[in-house]
């Protein structure tokens, strides 16, 4: 109960091409300290979609204010979805480390499917 859980409520989300996709993620604890990252895919070949700590991700916006004290909502919205964005997205909690942060726990993943743009 006390150990941090990463909850991605939806198993799957379907979005029409050109629209925005909201991928929801919540933590159950503020501990351990460390950033959140979103990836598409799992394993060594996974693609970084968003890094709370650093980087420029022009299509990604956070749904809530991540710097807000006691925030547990790490949902993101990805704009202008295309078929190339289809895949399984993982919300991953990292533990602050030196020199590098260490992966602590991953969400179960939300599969994003892309529907054809309505004509």
């Amino acid at each position: 109960e006390d150990e941090l859980q990463v909850i991605q409520p939806e198993k799957s989300v379907s979005v029409a091409a050109g629209e925005s996709a909201t991928l929801r993620c919540a933590m159950t604890s503020l501990i351990p300290v460390g950033p959140i990252m979103w990836f598409r895919g799992a394993g060594a070949g996974r693609e970084l979609i968003y890094n709370q700590k650093e980087g420029h991700f022009p299509r990604v916006t956070t749904v809530s204010e991540l710097t807000k004290r006691n925030n547990l909502d790490f949902s993101i919205s990805i704009s202008n979805i295309t078929p190339a964005d289809a895949g399984t997205y993982y919300c991953v909690k990292f533990r602050k480390g030196s020199p590098d942060d260490v992966e602590f726990k991953s969400g179960a993943g939300t599969e994003l499917s892309v529907r054809a743009k309505p004509s």
Epitope: E3, K11, D73, S75
Partner: antibody, heavy 122, light 112 residues
């Protein structure tokens, strides 16, 4: 230790509304889904809907869509279920149930309230 | 919605003997992640339901090891290796792969 304490029994007239509360203590309230499950006398279990307080939006079973409203107040760690246009068939025990530590919403219900009997009678 | 069908409806048991309850779903509960989204609950007389088994075969905290869950896809079984008097009540399976979650009709276990 997670505990869910529900409001007391209610007797309602047909056509009226009822609002049942479920106060959680122990553990994190905001991030876990809270569901409402009802049980008519001598019958089985029926999921009505649920909410993850941190996100605010609720999911409803189609059968109850438009008649049930599920809300949550993070400041008091309390979830609510309001059922409107009551009829005699809504006489049941209404349970709130909280998710366990699974990665998805409504994956399994690890903690249950004691139940609230709602009787609809003219 | 996914339809869950349990059998038998009623199960008279002898203490110390094994018991088995079947649950079938109208569509597969096996997710691409390898988990079966099938849970088992017990509702003892006059009490709220309690979680016994989640994700097909995982015993919930505090549940005795005489309870076990098995199966995959659309066919699942709850087994009690040696029934005790305190195991009486109604057992429900529930699918959790889709929203809304849906329950089986229940199996009433009673002592012979």
């Amino acid at each position: 230790q997670v505990q869910l304490v529900q409001s007391g029994a209610e007797v309602k007239k047909p056509g009226s509304s009822v609002k049942v509360s479920c106060k959680a203590s122990g553990g994190t309230f905001s991030s876990y889904a809270i569901s409402w499950v009802r049980q008519a006398p001598g019958q089985g279990l029926e999921w009505m809907g649920g909410i993850i307080p941190i996100f605010g939006t609720a999911n409803y079973a189609q059968k109850f869509q438009g008649r049930v409203t599920i809300t949550a107040d993070e400041s008091t760690s309390t979830a609510y279920m309001e059922l409107s246009s009551l009829r005699s068939e809504d006489t049941a025990v209404y349970y709130c149930a909280r998710d366990g530590g699974g990665g998805y919403a409504y994956e399994y219900f690890q903690h249950w309230g004691q139940g609230t009997l709602v009787t609809v009678s003219s | 919605d996914i339809v869950m069908t349990q059998s038998p409806l009623s199960l008279p048991v002898t203490p110390g003997e094994p018991a088995s309850i079947s649950c079938r779903s109208s569509q597969s509960l096996l997710h691409s992640n390898g988990y079966n989204y099938l849970d088992w609950y017990l509702q003892k007389p006059g009490q709220s339901p309690q979680l016994l088994i989640y994700l097909g075969s995982n015993r919930a905290s505090g549940v005795p090891d005489r309870f076990s869950g098995s199966g995959s896809g659309t066919d699942f079984t709850l087994k009690i290796s040696r029934v005790e008097a305190e195991d009486v009540g109604v057992y429900y399976c529930m699918q959790a792969i889709g929203v809304p979650p849906t329950f089986g009709g229940g199996t009433k276990v009673e002592i012979k």
